[in-house]
Amino acid sequence: ILLRAVTGFSGDGRAIWSKNPNFTPVNESQLFLYDTFPKNFFWGIGTGALQVEGSWKKDGKGPSIWDHFIHTHLKNVSSTNGSSDSYIFLEKDLSALDFIGVSFYQFSISWPRLFPDGIVTVANAKGLQYYSTLLDALVLRNIEPIVTLYHWDLPLALQEKYGGWKNDTIIDIFNDYATYCFQMFGDRVKYWITIHNPYLVAWHGYGTGMHAPGEKGNLAAVYTVGHNLIKAHSKVWHNYNTHFRPHQKGWLSITLGSHWIEPNRSENTMDIFKCQQSMVSVLGWFANPIHGDGDYPEGMRKKLFSVLPIFSEAEKHEMRGTADFFAFSFGPNNFKPLNTMAKMGQNVSLNLREALNWIKLEYNNPRILIAENGWFTDSRVKTEDTTAIYMMKNFLSQVLQAIRLDEIRVFGYTAWSLLDGFEWQDAYTIRRGLFYVDFNSKQKERKPKSSAHYYKQIIRENGFSL
């Protein structure tokens, strides 16, 4: 209440950039905190199907828009067959998970591995068997699965037939796919993520053309895609809430990604306003309809009125509250390359703690799962990834401070990623795994990097001990 009254920012995220120590929610007095995370803190690690599975056309899997994009847009990359081959080496992934000692494993289901042309008919048996075996193995190990339904690998057939996410027909098709997954896997899955970082799907898939399907320059298409992603998520949430939650008793959210930004001049109201607009145009675009009032942020509605679709009154009611926790992604994909429109002439920053405070203020202090966090190293770095350790320590320290000093309700952390793999537009030029994989080897051994040892220790100690 005090914050709202004094800053004049109505309790919104702009208070974060106030450098008056009485009013800013972030207390900068402790740069490093030696403390533990809350008891039963949820430690995990994640992968994306397209990045690690390989076997892009094996055992009846259909092509995805990324398989196609790799062949048509990315130089010097023949296919994701050269990745860490998780589809073949499932046991090696499980051993890697055992080594670290995580509480959960976040992975995504490849939609075209289950349904080659995207339409829910009879599932591809080998694909179904793969995910079922993985889930059984995780349950056996007491590792909680967090399952993402869509991590960018749209069945190519849906792109070619309907124009992909530009067409609202896909909303019902996605819901059918989700229904199938709930039916087949919901007995073993208590945490579901509908879509991973829809901002990047829309912005880079249809704006910059840096992601599949590689369309560019059509702002109306960007926001139509965003709109359909939000509506698809909402439809699936209501479906789960009505038909599956009563007996499966799980939780469902959508992973939203963002950068962080600092004003050029911390005392300048216009710069602070630009920082707020920057966060709103990336994170608020999706968070406001789902975690906020059910509509797009007012600033976006005014600025983009000619290209931003509308939510009707009924849809606003349908959208809002369709997430059981706030799943937040904070990593390189939202920073490089950064949308210059979103930057607004201000300074990007890797301050995860402040980003978490912004979410707390904007969306009424939700429970937060860090659903993706980490950095990257050059592809030449093998197992001695000191930069990755430095970044992990920094990020985890910020999360701990957010919990202990700012009373932010972070309940879990997903280190990204379990394995080196295919890194989207960067292909194999960077590595994000805690386990090193030699992509040219036959056996694709998972070798723990220094960061894997470090994360293992953090989990064992539940934080930073003196």
Epitope: T242, P309, I310, S312, E313, A314, E315, H317, G321
Partner: antibody, heavy 115, light 107 residues
Framework: QVQVKESGPGLVAPSQSLSITCTVS????????VSWIRQPPGKGLEWLGV???????NYHSALISRLTITKDNSKSQVFLKLNSLEADDTATYYC?????????WGQGTLVTVSA | DIQMTQTPSSLSASLGDRVTINCRAS??????FNWYQQKPNGTIKLLIY???RLQSGVPSRFSGSGSGTDYSLTISNLEQEDKATYFC?????????FGGGTKLEIK
Amino acid sequence: QVQVKESGPGLVAPSQSLSITCTVSGFSLTNYGVSWIRQPPGKGLEWLGVIWGDGSINYHSALISRLTITKDNSKSQVFLKLNSLEADDTATYYCAKTHDWFDYWGQGTLVTVSA
Amino acid sequence: DIQMTQTPSSLSASLGDRVTINCRASQDISNYFNWYQQKPNGTIKLLIYYTSRLQSGVPSRFSGSGSGTDYSLTISNLEQEDKATYFCHQVRTLPWTFGGGTKLEIK
């Protein structure tokens, strides 16, 4: 299956209040909105207001000072109260299950405002 | 408020005919647009929602189209039971508004 039914007083004196109850079955009021619509004799339809699953309400701006919509989820009932009635409030009053469309309507209840 | 101008206000057609009813909004309503049928006994049912989607149980001879400000309802192969008044409806902006109605008579 979904059913919607209005029950009202039939005749109301001018300056008095009108109360109508809409009883629904086949769906939950916690999940869906219900709108009130009226139709004066021989004329078109006029939307009055909606109460949503979460309890929030939108009223027609022309009636906001006289109209109150409430509900009782446990009884599956929605209530309309219109104050200070005049002759041109004479109409058939309908309630309807609401999304971005009215997919199920009641049969309507005729309300005549007359001394 | 968004005004909905419906034309014609009445029409008469023969069994088997194809008829079209039009509705024009005073501003862009982004396909948030519906059609209803009111029978002579007063019962109302939804025919078409979101401009062109056929409500479950409605015969396929009813179809809707349009965008922006202009929308239409087409009934092909007219049947006796189609004698009714048809209303258009926008939900783009509050307050939601209806067209004045089109009374369809069968010759």
